[in-house]
């Protein structure tokens, strides 16, 4: 029961999450015009990763894309990339995970697959929710680097008379949007992984029996072919998945429904 | 076509206060900021303040703050300029301004405050 | 707050002038985030309400005659009527639409000769 409600709920923690990413990644307000210098601006400026936008004194947004792929800065492509890499698997992840579900009955399918698609789906949105964050922080720490280079050289003189206040950008809503939904997705993610241990088939108790052999006093107790054959010594029962985060080989290595007779 | 109808003139006493109305009609009432501005005889125009209809945010003069309110009743398309403690200097023509790039003008209530 | 400065406050001249009013802000009106000045020019008629002709300090209002055209950045921008028709005899004015308060000039009344 336990389990189930750790899948259940690190599904629906990984959903918001990705959900979460999608909207951050489409959301607008990734740097917003700091109002600091300028509390009364009727032009605000906010850019995402896809357009930039400015809001009028009218209150009328007209927002331009960036028709360019070459001509925008490595960092915005590779926050985009990060961003876009972590929304993809975090739908294949959620996609798997709908299927590992144990509430949810596909077929004949075994505990061990549904094990296996647990920690994949787990795996999966623990590296989505990395990579928004990724995504997210770096284009924050591009923010503080490009304002804090606008503050040195804030104002410019204009034929001596003049100041010109130079545009800064401040962190804008997406980015938090952002690092809570990559936080989720994460959350999630360990959710399904720590869930995955549970769903594993767990060893059967086979107590230790001793065989006399005629003339001889020496027990002989299963347990000697572990990996091969799925008995164990053990009296207790014993989570196969003790790690949690085992790499998908190490995980076929373990025994199956199966292996069992 | 885009139109704004402002209420008639008014004539006030120093101290009193003026509501003035502007109707809009052939634009999304809530599309865009209802700006109004002030001209007296003879003198440059000048900005009083603005209403956002969608959240009923403003932003004032600090000229006006404390003076000047302005609201929106967005069922009936109609922005109100209330101007209290009217001195003779608050005599002039007022205009409500809309659309993208402040396009649109009212035709001006001429409010006169004379004792 | 951005104070409008506009010279001549008046001027006279003749139908088929080509005529040019300047228009100084105290400060810049350009805005990075779409590479737009944010000056505005007014014409009113006596008795009427101001009716926009250029926005962005350079671009014409719809139904606006090509005759009139906006120039300038920053700071310094100006306002010129190529041949001067008996309809533009009015008085222009000049707009600060990029921070509040909204502030504009002091007018410029342009009469026959």
């Known amino acids: 029961m336990a389990v189930t409600a750790c899948q259940g709920l690190g599904f629906v923690v990984s959903l918001i999450g990705i959900a979460g990413i999608i909207a951050a990644t489409c959301m607008d307000q990734w740097s917003t015009q700091d109002l600091y210098n300028n509390p009364v601006t009727a032009v605000f400026n906010y850019q995402g990763l896809w357009r930039s936008c400015v809001r009028e004194s009218s209150g009328f947004t007209e927002c331009r894309g960036y028709f360019t792929l070459l001509g925008l800065p490595a960092m915005l492509q590779a926050v985009r990339a990060l961003m876009i890499v972590g929304i993809v698997l975090g739908a294949i992840g959620l996609l798997v995970s709908i299927f590992a579900l144990k509430c949810i009955r596909i077929g004949s399918m075994e505990d061990s697959a549904k094990a296996n698609m647990t920690l994949t789906s787990g795996i999966m949105f623990i590296v989505s929710g990395l990579c928004a964050i990724a995504g997210v922080s770096v284009f924050a720490n591009m923010l503080v680097t490009n304002f804090w280079m606008s503050t040195a050289n804030m104002y410019t003189g204009m034929g001596g008379m003049v100041q010109t206040v130079q545009t800064r950008y401040t962190f804008g809503a997406a980015l938090f949007v952002g690092w809570v939904a990559g936080g989720l997705t994460l959350i999630g993610g360990v959710m399904m992984c720590i869930a995955c241990r549970g769903l594993a088939p767990e060893e059967t108790n086979y107590k230790a029996v001793s065989y006399h052999a005629s003339g001889h006093s020496v027990a002989y107790k299963p347990g000697g072919f572990k990996a091969s054959t799925g008995f164990g010594s053990n009296t207790k029962n014993k989570k196969i998945y003790d790690g949690g985060a085992r790499t998908e080989d190490e995980v076929q290595s373990y025994p199956s429904k199966h292996d069992y007779v | 076509q885009v139109q704004l109808v402002q209420s008639g003139a008014e004539v006030k006493k120093p101290g009193a206060s003026v509501k003035v109305s502007c109707k809009a009609s052939?634009?999304?009432?809530?599309?865009?900021?209802m700006h109004w501005v002030r001209q007296a005889p003879g003198q440059r125009l000048e900005w009083i303040g603005y209403?956002?209809?969608?959240?009923?945010?403003?932003s004032y003069n600090q000229k006006f703050k404390g003076r000047v309110t302005i609201t929106v009743d967005t069922s009936a398309s109609t922005a109100y300029m209330e101007l209290s403690s009217l001195r003779s200097e608050d005599t002039a023509v007022y205009y409500c301004?809309?659309?993208?790039?402040?396009?649109?003008w009212g035709q001006g209530t001429t409010v006169t405050v004379s004792s | 707050d951005i104070q409008m400065t506009q010279s001549p406050s008046s001027l006279s001249a003749s139908v088929g002038d080509r005529v040019t009013i300047t228009c100084r802000s105290s400060?810049?009106?350009?805005?990075?985030?779409?590479?737009?000045?944010?000056l505005t020019w007014y014409q009113q008629k006596p008795g009427k309400a101001p009716k926009l002709l250029i926005y962005?300090?350079?671009t014409r209002e719809s139904g606006v005659p090509s005759r009139f055209s906006g120039s300038g950045s920053g700071t310094d921008f100006t306002l010129t009527i190529s041949s001067l028709q008996p309809e533009d005899f009015a008085t222009y004015y000049c707009?600060?639409?990029?921070?509040?308060?909204?502030?504009f000039g002091g007018g410029t009344k342009l009469e026959i000769k």
């Open positions: 301004v809309t659309t993208r790039y402040l396009a649109v």
């Open positions: 052939g634009y999304t009432f809530t599309d865009y900021n």
């Open positions: 209403i956002n209809p969608n959240n009923g945010g403003t």
């Open positions: 400060q810049s009106l350009f805005n990075s985030g779409n590479q737009k000045n944010y």
């Open positions: 962005w300090a350079s």
């Open positions: 707009q600060n639409d990029y921070s509040y308060p909204l502030t």
